[in-house]
Every structure is written in C-alpha cells, then in structure tokens.
C-alpha cells in the first residue's frame, strides 16, 4: 500500500531534495529556504535564487522550508509552573521545562505542568524522579502508599485497598478493641 501523500508532499517529491515545485509552474524546481528564513518570493526561473527573508523577532523556522510566514515562538506557560530553558531564536522555538526537583505531567501531547518530585518521607526511593515521571516510593513498615506519599497505617480504613499492606496493624487495633470488651 502506498501511503497517502498530501498535495504539498506530492509536489515536493517531483523535485530533488532541498527543492520544491514552483506553485505556478510545475516545470521549475526552486531551492527551499534555510532554517531561520521564510519564503518571500518563489524563484523566477530554473537555476535562479529563491527570495528568502530572515524571520522577524518572535518567530522562527526550525528546518528548510517554503513557508510564506515564520512560525510564532511558543510561550512557556507560567500558570503551569513552566520555566524558559532557552529563548526562541530565528531557527529554534522556545524550549520550556521545569525547575530542579520537579517533573513534567503531560495533560496532553503539548500541554505539561510542573510538579514537585515526591521526597518519599517514611519510605525509600525505589525509582528516582525523572523528567517526565515522579519518584516511585516504597514505604516503611507501618506505612502505605497513597497518592505517592507514605501514610501511616493508623489512617487506613477497612474499606480501603491499604488493608492488605496494613493487615498486622489493623489486626492489632482489632485485637485491642476486642480485649477492651472483656
């Protein structure tokens, strides 16, 4: 099966790499613009230069192209705790990330929020915090994992999943209650 090509891809595939088909004359292949520039005017004829102009401040192109406009620079989302790792340049978009000891939680493919890495209090670090994943904690005896925090088994209600992990403690509490009734 041949993958479906869009009109632009079809047109480009007729020309050698680094060139594109003139939109008004399909017998002409024009040289693509370098990254950091955009297409101002198509080449007037074979072997003649494409008119490429540098992207203005606040815009960029990250690869060779024949775009009529540069792309707008992304802005880091302060409300999501993001910080700017590197500024936008004419040939590279803004790079956003998180502060030290934080990880990214992706709400969607393009939208992430920064959260503090768990410290594993009352437990030990099983897997260290990574760029896109929180620390994985293992809890000490007498504690159970709830929302990635080690919580005392005294907070474990019988109806909750923690009963398996806190079984000895729950039995002790039950035993104390029973002995109090005699």
């Amino acid at each position: 099966l041949v993958p479906h090509l869009g009109d632009r891809e079809k047109r480009d595939s007729v020309c050698p790499q680094g060139k594109y088909i003139h939109p008004q004359n399909n017998s002409i292949c024009c040289t693509k613009c370098h990254k950091g520039t955009y297409l101002y005017n198509d080449c007037p004829g074979p072997g003649q230069d494409t008119d490429c102009r540098e992207c203005e401040s606040g815009s960029f192109t990250a690869s060779e192209n024949h775009l009529r406009h540069c792309l707008s620079c992304s802005k880091c989302r302060k409300e999501m705790g993001q910080v700017e790792i590197s500024s936008c340049t004419v040939d590279r978009d803004t790079v956003c990330g998180c502060r030290k000891n934080q990880y990214r939680h992706y709400w969607s493919e393009n939208l992430f929020q920064c959260f503090n890495c768990s410290l594993c209090l009352n437990g030990t670090v099983h897997l260290s915090c990574q760029e896109k994943q929180n620390t994985v904690c293992t809890c000490h005896a007498g504690f159970f994992l709830r929302e990635n925090e080690c919580v005392s088994c005294s907070n474990c209600k019988k109806s909750l999943e923690c009963t398996k992990l806190c079984l000895p403690q729950i039995e002790n509490v039950k035993g104390t209650e029973d002995s109090g009734t005699t």
């Epitope: 939680h105 709400w107 969607s108 393009n110 939208l111 959260f115 929302e147 990635n148």
Partner: nanobody, 122 residues
Framework: EVQLLESGGGLVQPGGSLRLSCAAS????????MGWARQAPGKGLEWVSF????????YYADSVKGRFTISRDNSKNTLYLQMNSLRAEDTAVYYC???????????????WGQGTLVTVSS
Amino acid sequence: EVQLLESGGGLVQPGGSLRLSCAASGFTFSDYTMGWARQAPGKGLEWVSFIDSDGLHTYYADSVKGRFTISRDNSKNTLYLQMNSLRAEDTAVYYCAQNPQYAYESSRFDYWGQGTLVTVSS
C-alpha cells in the same frame, strides 16, 4: 450518550462555602481527565481546575489556588469542586467538562454539562 450533570450551585455570602458536584454517565469516567470551567456574566470562559483520571495531578487557576479543591470519586462517577472563602468575583456559571486539557490549549470542546449558577453576594 455522554451526560454531565452539575449541581450544588446557589446563593452564598462572601467568605462562605459551596460544594459543586458533577454526575457523569455514558462513558468510562475513570479513564478521563475532568475539569471545571466558569463563565462570569459578560465575560469569557475561564478554566478553574482539572484533575487527571486517577486523581494524582491537579491544576488550579491562580485566582482560585488555596481556596478551591477539585476531587473525584471514580466509584461514584462523580467530580467535585469544594469552594471556600468565596468572593463576589467567583460569581459565574460553573461547567463540568470531559477532557478539559484540549479545550484549555485549543478551544476544542468535547463534552460539557449545562452548568450551575454560583452567586456570591451579601
């Protein structure tokens, strides 16, 4: 058919509290990020909060941080918004939404409830 039904709105004095609920049906609730948005009279839609499918991650708008708490009960297919220290500027219609993260970044709206009105006034 996806249905989201909000309740719990009403008239409350400044400094008071309300708890909004959103009963969901017609889809596997525990698989979806859910959220709350609001629209004040004559203003645009504002994202208030959202929560991921297992309740581990939450987002709050700066305007409600420390006052509002989002939570969910996947066993009851219900989303909640606990609103404390309410202010006049919190007056709005509050909407429950499925997959709010997409609407947040690109105004692609999936499923919304009909809204519940919260009025903060003395």
